[in-house]
């Protein structure tokens, strides 16, 4: 028998520095977690103790903090090289700055193979990107070889900016011939490493003949066997065992997100490459693990540029940006409109001639807007200003909801109106009218939404049975501020870009902004 240790990360999302327990900015260092310096300590400890070790990343290193905003992927290549990753799969967020924003900082600089079998380049891009990412890689480990085959969410064109010269194929259809090639190369230990979410990971384990292990990402799935060490609630045991269609037991793993855990899976193979046993657990990277001093010193060196950036002007406002709780928790506020407009703008994807865009709607809990911005400071808006407005380090995500769920959400928005509670919704691409004289749960008297399948966008009444795409904070997607109906009833959820980054990019693009209060939210006569 031959034993392999798979160390894995996924959805690190720019958390190069240690973070608080909820993966936001580290405040009390003695209670902070993760970060590449701490990760390196643990990886090195395992490499020294065990003979056959692979360090793999399942995508979405890009996007999530000011590190990515400033360094645009160069930080990912630099620190992943320093940690000596063995391979990485492309995630959807790796395309956030377009194909060029992937090729130059990451693909050309990574000292490890970057993989995806279901992304096919065409046109002029084909020769430019040739060899910079691969469908699979055969890695020598000890006296054996291990095949790693990559995959990426086929939804990427709707979630990011891969352009028109990359085709995202069905994962299973694309993976099978590559796995067959590996078998033809007499490679009998095969890991599928990719970024399509836990449901697809399980399907790959079930359907792709010859895959021995699946290491996934995208859905931030936390798996654990035994008592979990932190706040994350396991979605299942680690590893999660899937019985393949040809009767094999295939371990599937994922390691939550944000570099908080290091996935640790031990696999025992027989001489024919069959999995005999698999066991392990994610390792919580808490403060009991010291940060590696040399990596930490490097982080501190790179950090200097971030501090300078946060005080630079992004753009100007010529109006007061009202982000006060007195406004945003009671009525339409122009800060809410600005943020929602930025959220929609960030999700412009013309992937179908029938649609002017794939999504037109935004909702945003008023309680998530934490500060106004005064225009009387020469109109200057900085990253620092935006960090005061959006201090929680969240993301603006894409969900699919039925009209009936949206109606419930808007009822919840005003079910206890007047108490300055955070659930009051700010909107974009939606016109809502409330009648507060009616009983809670029946206060929405009009709810019109902007069409997407139209050449001239206009507002139509919400249809209860129709499925709509909506951009919203991850906080709401996870049922925050009492929006349990969104969490329970959402049909699809894809994590998006860092909230501050979305707004800062929009302001930089617009240069001068002047958001107004324009009647998106109304109260029917006599009730307000």
């Amino acid at each position: 028998a031959w034993e392999l240790t798979i160390l894995h990360t996924n959805d690190v999302h720019s958390r190069l520095e240690q973070t608080s327990e909820d993966s936001s900015k580290c405040v009390n260092a003695s209670r902070c977690m993760g970060g590449v310096a701490r990760l390196f300590t643990k990886v090195q400890q395992i490499r020294r103790a065990e003979p056959n070790v692979l360090l793999l990343d399942a995508g979405d290193q890009y996007q999530g903090t000011i590190w990515f905003t400033v360094y645009k992927g160069a930080e990912v290549a630099h620190f992943m090289n320093a940690l000596r990753y063995d391979a990485m799969a492309l995630g959807n967020h790796e395309f956030d700055n377009g194909v060029e924003g992937l090729i130059e900082p990451l693909l050309k600089e990574a000292k490890f193979p970057i993989l995806s079998a279901n992304i096919k380049a065409k046109g002029p891009l084909a020769s430019q990107i040739s060899g910079l990412y691969l469908p699979y890689k055969v890695l020598p480990v000890g006296d054996e070889v291990v095949g790693i085959v990559g995959y990426t969410s086929k939804e990427t064109p709707f979630l990011s900016n891969p352009g028109t010269n990359l085709v995202f194929e069905d994962e299973i259809t694309a993976l099978q011939p590559e796995v067959d090639k590996l078998k033809t190369l007499n490679v009998n230990k095969i890991i599928a490493l990719g970024h399509s979410g836990f449901e697809m990971d399980k399907l790959i384990a079930q359907k792709v003949r010859g895959v021995d292990v699946v290491v996934g990402g995208h859905s931030n799935t936390f798996l654990y066997t035994g008592n979990p060490p932190s706040k994350e609630v396991p979605a299942g045991k680690y590893p999660f065992i899937v019985t393949s269609d040809d009767g094999r037991k295939v371990p599937v793993v994922q390691a939550y997100a944000f570099g908080k855990y290091l996935g640790y899976l031990k696999i025992e193979f027989d001489e024919r490459g069959n999995v005999i046993s698999s066991h392990g657990n994610p390792i919580l990277l808490n403060s009991s693990i010291p940060e590696d001093p040399s990596i930490k010193a490097d982080i501190n060196k790179w950090r200097i540029k971030l501090d300078n950036y946060s005080t630079q002007e992004l753009g100007k406002t010529i109006v007061y940006l009202d982000g006060s709780s007195q406004s945003c928790r009671f009525r339409e506020c122009n800060m809410g409109n600005l943020i929602c407009d930025a959220m929609i703008n960030n999700n412009l994807r013309h992937t179908d001639e029938m649609f002017w865009n794939h999504v037109s709607m935004c909702i945003l809990n008023g309680g998530g807007i934490r500060s106004p911005i005064d225009e009387r400071n020469n109109g200057t808006i900085t990253w620092e200003n935006l960090a005061a407005v959006l201090p929680f380090g969240g993301t603006f995500d894409l969900v699919q909801l039925k009209g009936s769920t949206l109606k419930k959400a808007f009822e919840h928005s005003v079910h206890r109106y007047g108490q300055s509670t955070g659930e009051f919704l700010q909107v974009g691409g939606i016109h809502v009218v409330y009648d507060l004289s009616r009983k809670p749960g029946d206060r929405v008297v009009k709810l019109d939404v902007l069409c997407t399948k139209c050449r001239v966008p206009s507002y139509d009444p919400l249809k209860m049975d129709e499925v709509y795409k909506v951009i919203l904070p991850n906080f709401l997607a996870n049922g925050g501020d009492g929006f349990q109906m969104i969490k329970d009833e959402l049909l699809r959820h894809d994590s998006g870009d860092q909230d501050i980054n979305v707004v800062s990019t929009y302001i930089s693009k617009m240069k001068v902004i002047y958001p107004a209060v324009e009647g998106r939210i109304k109260f029917s006569t006599g009730s307000h």
Epitope: D86, A110, K111, F112, V138, P140, T184, L185, N186
Partner: antibody, heavy 118, light 107 residues
Framework: QVQLVQSGAEVKKPGASVKVSCKTS????????IYWVKQRPGQGLEWIGW????????KYNEKFKGRVTITADKSASTAYMELSSLRSEDTAVYYC???????????WGQGTLVTVSS | DIQMTQSPSSLSASVGDRVTITCKAS??????VAWYQQKPGKAPKLLIY???TRHTGVPSRFSGSGSGTDHTLTISSLQPEDFATYYC?????????FGQGTKLEIK
Amino acid sequence: QVQLVQSGAEVKKPGASVKVSCKTSGYTFTNYYIYWVKQRPGQGLEWIGWIYPGNLNIKYNEKFKGRVTITADKSASTAYMELSSLRSEDTAVYYCARDDNYAWFAYWGQGTLVTVSS
Amino acid sequence: DIQMTQSPSSLSASVGDRVTITCKASQDVSTAVAWYQQKPGKAPKLLIYWTNTRHTGVPSRFSGSGSGTDHTLTISSLQPEDFATYYCQQHYSTPFTFGQGTKLEIK
């Protein structure tokens, strides 16, 4: 473009050692295998071994084990093959080659002639 | 080790001819066979891998076929620059092994 440039011809006495270098450029050194291949005068090709610079894993053809040492210097993007206890049958052209994606030899160095003669 | 036996060891042909070189493996190598061209004093050049996939820049007159133990390289219409020695190689398992070569000469 991908290039592999080998060190120059060597003449060695039996029992001596020789170290052939293979300097690469035009691609990321750590991401591809470097293979070494032997070709005796007027003869066919023999695979000596590989090094994968990413994790410095080395594999030798059993036939060459013991006298051959393959190494790499990541910072210089250069691979080396050292052959010790030279004998006359080691007289050959030694090639380094790079894979495309494992196991076939897509790009070759120009070859280094090693002559073993007393 | 897997033995690769090429035939013929040499052959004479004329410009425009169709030429076939065969390679027999001592055991099943599936479709894991590559073909190389070597000219005197030069390094070998990859022509084909995976039995029938042409390497970048290789003219379409070169084609490969086969599976299991029997593999073939075909040059559909010989050009003057094609006179060289050709080697097959199995990339199925280590140690990777080559055929002894086929020398293609001008008739």
